[in-house]
């Protein structure tokens, strides 16, 4: 069974998938469609790297631009370095500026909804 066939079988169960499962899926050429991606738990999407999201979506990565103002894409963008977002070439904006240090302060994030940044 190839990645696409596997994805079709598990698609209806993915809404509650944890980050670890999404990371694993990203290695299997599943080409997740945007409608499915948008239904994923925000907390499961946030830890994914730009490279992992690109592999997870395949050619559907194109659709991130259309959804950049909507959750979970919006919140995910805020967590990525702008340099990394630029590798997608889609014009996604709002990432962490180059030269900033990201502090993983869980309590700070829980309160504000965004990561804590230290300027250059």
């Amino acid at each position: 069974m190839n990645g696409s066939e596997y994805f079709v079988k598990i698609q209806s169960f993915l809404g509650g998938a944890p980050t670890e499962d999404l990371k694993a899926l990203s290695q299997q050429n599943v080409s997740m469609d945007l409608a499915t991606f948008m239904k994923l738990r925000t907390d499961a999407v946030l830890p994914l790297t730009v490279a992992e999201v690109q592999k997870l979506l395949g050619p559907h990565v194109e659709g991130l631009k259309a959804e950049e103002r909507h959750r979970p894409v919006r919140d995910w963008i805020l967590r990525q370095r702008q340099d990394d977002l630029d590798t997608l070439g889609l014009g996604l904006q709002g990432g962490i500026p180059n030269g900033y240090l990201v502090l993983d302060l869980s309590m700070q994030e829980a309160l504000s909804g965004t990561p804590c940044l230290l300027g250059p």
């Epitope: 469609d33 945007l34 050619p59 559907h60 194109e62 659709g63 631009k65 259309a66 340099d83 977002l85 630029d86 590798t87 070439g89 889609l90 014009g91 996604l92 904006q93």
Partner: antibody
Framework: QVQLQQPGTELVKPGASVRLSCRAS????????MHWVKQRPGQGLEWLGN????????NYNEKFRNRATLAVDKSSTTAYLQLTSLTSEDSAVYFC???????WGQGTTLTVSS | DIQMTQSPASLSASVGETVTITCRAS??????LAWYQQKQGKSPQLLVY???TLAEGVSSRFSGSGSGTQFSLKINSLQPEDFGTYYC?????????FGGGTKLEIR
């Protein structure tokens, strides 16, 4: 001002090579793939390829892979299309296009003639 | 490669009429389709992207629809400035093929 600037015309001889330029301004050059599109006189649009200024990744239309080379210079926010072994079939308008399709250059008219 | 088939190749219509141009993809491209308008001697201009999202500054007389393999561009109440050539292009991977174009002329 957000724009893509291209020279108006290029005249070259058959068998020669040419490098067409496209200078981007007014937006983050590194954030978008740059595409190149060919249009022969009175004909439709033909996609040649695209290049990612950040990663250097390039995709080519197989038809042009052997004679077309895409490149970018991030310091001058300029994209380039080089065409080799030119024939009359290469006489066309060449457009550079930002990935989202919102922004097109004015096009360079390439004439291949002896 | 994904092939894009546009129809009709040419179309004559009068000011005030409504016209529809169609585009068919050789395989599923979901909603990754753009429509462009080109006037003689000018660069193409984006009208619609993601199959149905109107580009900034484009008249609401234009509307895109469809998904999968079948798409259409509808122009309501044609105006003199609408005449020109229209192209569809898929945005699902590469190569990003264009349709053959539809030339819209004044009757």
């Amino acid at each position: 001002q957000v724009q893509l600037q291209q020279p108006g015309t290029e005249l070259v001889k058959p068998g020669a090579s040419v490098r067409l330029s496209c200078r981007a301004s007014g937006y983050s050059f590194s954030s978008y793939w740059m595409h190149w599109v060919k249009q022969r006189p009175g004909q439709g649009l033909e996609w040649l390829g695209n290049i990612n200024p950040t990663t250097g990744d390039i995709n080519y239309n197989e038809k042009f892979r052997n004679r077309a080379t895409l490149a970018v210079d991030k310091s001058s926010t300029t994209a380039y299309l080089q065409l080799t072994s030119l024939t009359s079939e290469d006489s066309a308008v060449y457009f550079c296009v930002r990935h989202d399709g919102f922004l097109w250059g004015q096009g360079t008219t390439l004439t291949v003639s002896s | 490669d994904i092939q894009m088939t546009q129809s009709p190749a040419s179309l004559s219509a009068s000011v005030g009429e409504t016209v529809t141009i169609t585009c068919r993809a050789s395989e599923n491209i979901y909603s990754y389709l753009a429509w462009y308008q080109q006037k003689q001697g000018k660069s193409p201009q984006l009208l619609v992207y993601y199959a149905k999202t109107l580009a900034e500054g484009v008249s609401s007389r234009f509307s895109g629809s469809g998904s999968g393999t079948q798409f259409s561009l509808k122009i309501n109440s044609l105006q003199p400035e609408d005449f020109g050539t229209y192209y569809c292009q898929h945005q699902f991977g590469t190569p990003r093929t264009f349709g053959g174009g539809t030339k819209l002329e004044i009757r």
